[in-house]
């Protein structure tokens, strides 16, 4: 891979010196380094109106290196780019710009959002939740006996948390009314969450509507429609007392 002699050969500056500083193989008083020692990269640094040659172990920020057979050379990335693979492809943008497909942008394109940690434009990620798990046993104050009406709960997991612009997560907990065949608690059964129970179908007028549990909003983003003001809650409590069905609401 020998370099063929170009038509325009570099003329050595009159003040070429062999006793050069820091990594230079040849240098001049006016231009600094003209060539570098093996494995070092040659870069041109602008100082005022003139360019000075320097020899470095690796290319500085805003430059990329090419290892030619006869010279290791640093080339400037585009102005808005901090690290690049070559002239066409940036791999890290300067502050205030977002990286998208090798380019540095002020704002991310439609359908993408800015990741302020990586400073890259990324796909919008929507919330994903699993299927509901089965309903829990019907309980009241942690017991599965000694009562007629209780509550049962079911949960689902968040599989994918949403990104900043993604769709919010729906509730991950639901609680609903349930009824059991009233039975006396056996000795030692008090407070024990049993598995066996008979679930009675709700009486006419009794609601078995599942309501998202208050806990669900701690693990997912709250949807505005699910918020209830104090008056609505009071109103609901009155209606529920009339129906003799208690319903847990979202707070």
């Amino acid at each position: 891979q020998n370099a063929s002699r170009g038509r325009r050969q570099r003329r050595m500056h009159p003040n070429v010196s062999q006793g050069c500083q820091g990594g230079c193989a040849t240098c001049s008083d006016y231009n600094g380094c003209l060539s570098c020692k093996p494995r070092l990269f040659f870069a041109l640094e602008r100082i005022g109106m003139k360019q000075i040659g320097v020899c470095l172990s690796s290319c500085p920020s805003g430059y990329y290196g090419t290892r030619y057979p006869d010279i290791n050379k640093c080339t400037k990335c585009k102005a808005d780019c901090d690290t690049c693979f070559n002239k066409n492809f940036c791999t890290k943008c300067k502050s205030g710009f977002y990286l998208h497909l090798g380019k540095c942008l002020d704002n991310c394109p439609e359908g993408l959002e800015a990741n302020n940690h990586t400073m890259e434009c990324v796909s919008i990620v929507h919330c994903e939740v699993s299927e509901w798990n089965p309903w829990s046993p019907c309980t009241k104050k942690g017991k599965t006996c000694g009562f007629k009406r209780g509550t049962e709960t079911r949960v689902r997991e968040i599989i994918q948390h949403p990104s900043a612009k993604g769709n919010l997560c729906p509730p991950t907990n639901e609680t609903r009314k349930c009824t059991v065949q009233r039975k006396k608690c056996q000795k030692g059964e008090r407070g024990k969450k049993g598995r066996e129970r008979k679930r009675k179908k709700p009486n006419k007028g009794e609601s078995k509507e599942a309501i998202p549990d208050s806990k669900s909003l701690e693990s997912s983003k709250e949807i505005p429609e699910q918020r209830e003001n104090k008056q609505q809650q009071k109103k609901r409590k009155v209606q529920d007392k009339q129906k003799s069905v208690s319903v847990s609401t979202v707070h």
Partner: antibody, heavy 116, light 107 residues
């Protein structure tokens, strides 16, 4: 839109010469090192030569060094490959490419057949 | 010169199947590594640069990984338009060298 259009290919006898040209448009030609990459029929890619952006230095693959020369005219945005002492093993499609560590832009290629 | 060992030489995949191509490099090249795709009768096109970064217009089912001496290209869900030859290249130093290629066919 970036365009690289090669020309000058054809059938040539062993030992003879051929000159390929590549007309570039859609990018700043004088900013880029330019290269020739070839591909023999049903074979892989082989780098042939690169000339740096200002034409002052050129590099060649072992198989063509001393026989091929590369030049460019930045005023015409054109790259050239002068191929002398051609051999049958030089038979290939020759691609003109913008070479900046990777080969970012490619021409459609031109076929060179060396046969008696 | 840096040697590139690409495998397999050919590969047949069903629609939707995940495919992997590997390239081993004779010396540490950090992430100065590129993948190209060449469809039948066409010129090669840059697919992935800097080992893992997708060129504009390349579908997200393509991904590149690796650093140092071992690199791979993965297609998650083979599509008819992915039928092509794939080449790796080291961009670490001169002379630029290519892998021998992997011909990917649709079953």
């Amino acid at each position: 839109e970036v365009q690289l259009v090669e020309s000058g290919g054809g059938l040539v006898q062993p030992g003879r010469s051929l000159k390929l040209s590549c007309a570039a448009s859609g990018f700043t030609f004088s900013d880029y090192d330019m290269a020739w990459v070839r591909q023999a029929p049903k074979k892989g890619l082989e780098w042939v030569a690169t000339i740096i952006y200002d034409g002052s230095r050129a590099y060649f693959g072992d198989s063509v060094r001393g026989r091929f020369t590369v030049s460019r005219d930045n005023t015409k945005s054109t790259l050239y490959l002068q191929m002398d002492s051609l051999r049958s093993e030089d038979t290939a499609t020759y691609y003109c490419t913008a070479h900046d560590r990777s080969f970012d832009y490619w021409g459609q290629g031109v076929m060179v057949t060396v046969s008696s | 010169d840096i040697q590139m060992t690409q495998s397999p030489a050919s590969l047949s995949a069903s629609l939707g199947e995940t495919v992997s191509i590997e390239c081993l490099v004779s010396e540490d090249i950090s992430n100065d590594f590129v993948w190209y795709q060449q469809k039948s009768g066409k010129s090669p096109q840059l697919l992935i640069y800097a080992a893992s970064r997708l060129q504009d217009g390349v579908p997200s089912r393509f991904s590149g990984s690796g650093s140092g001496t071992r690199f791979s290209l993965r297609i998650s869900g083979m599509q008819p338009e992915d039928e092509a030859e794939y080449f790796c290249q080291q961009s670490y130093k001169y002379p630029p060298t290519f892998g021998a290629g992997t011909k990917l066919e649709l079953k």
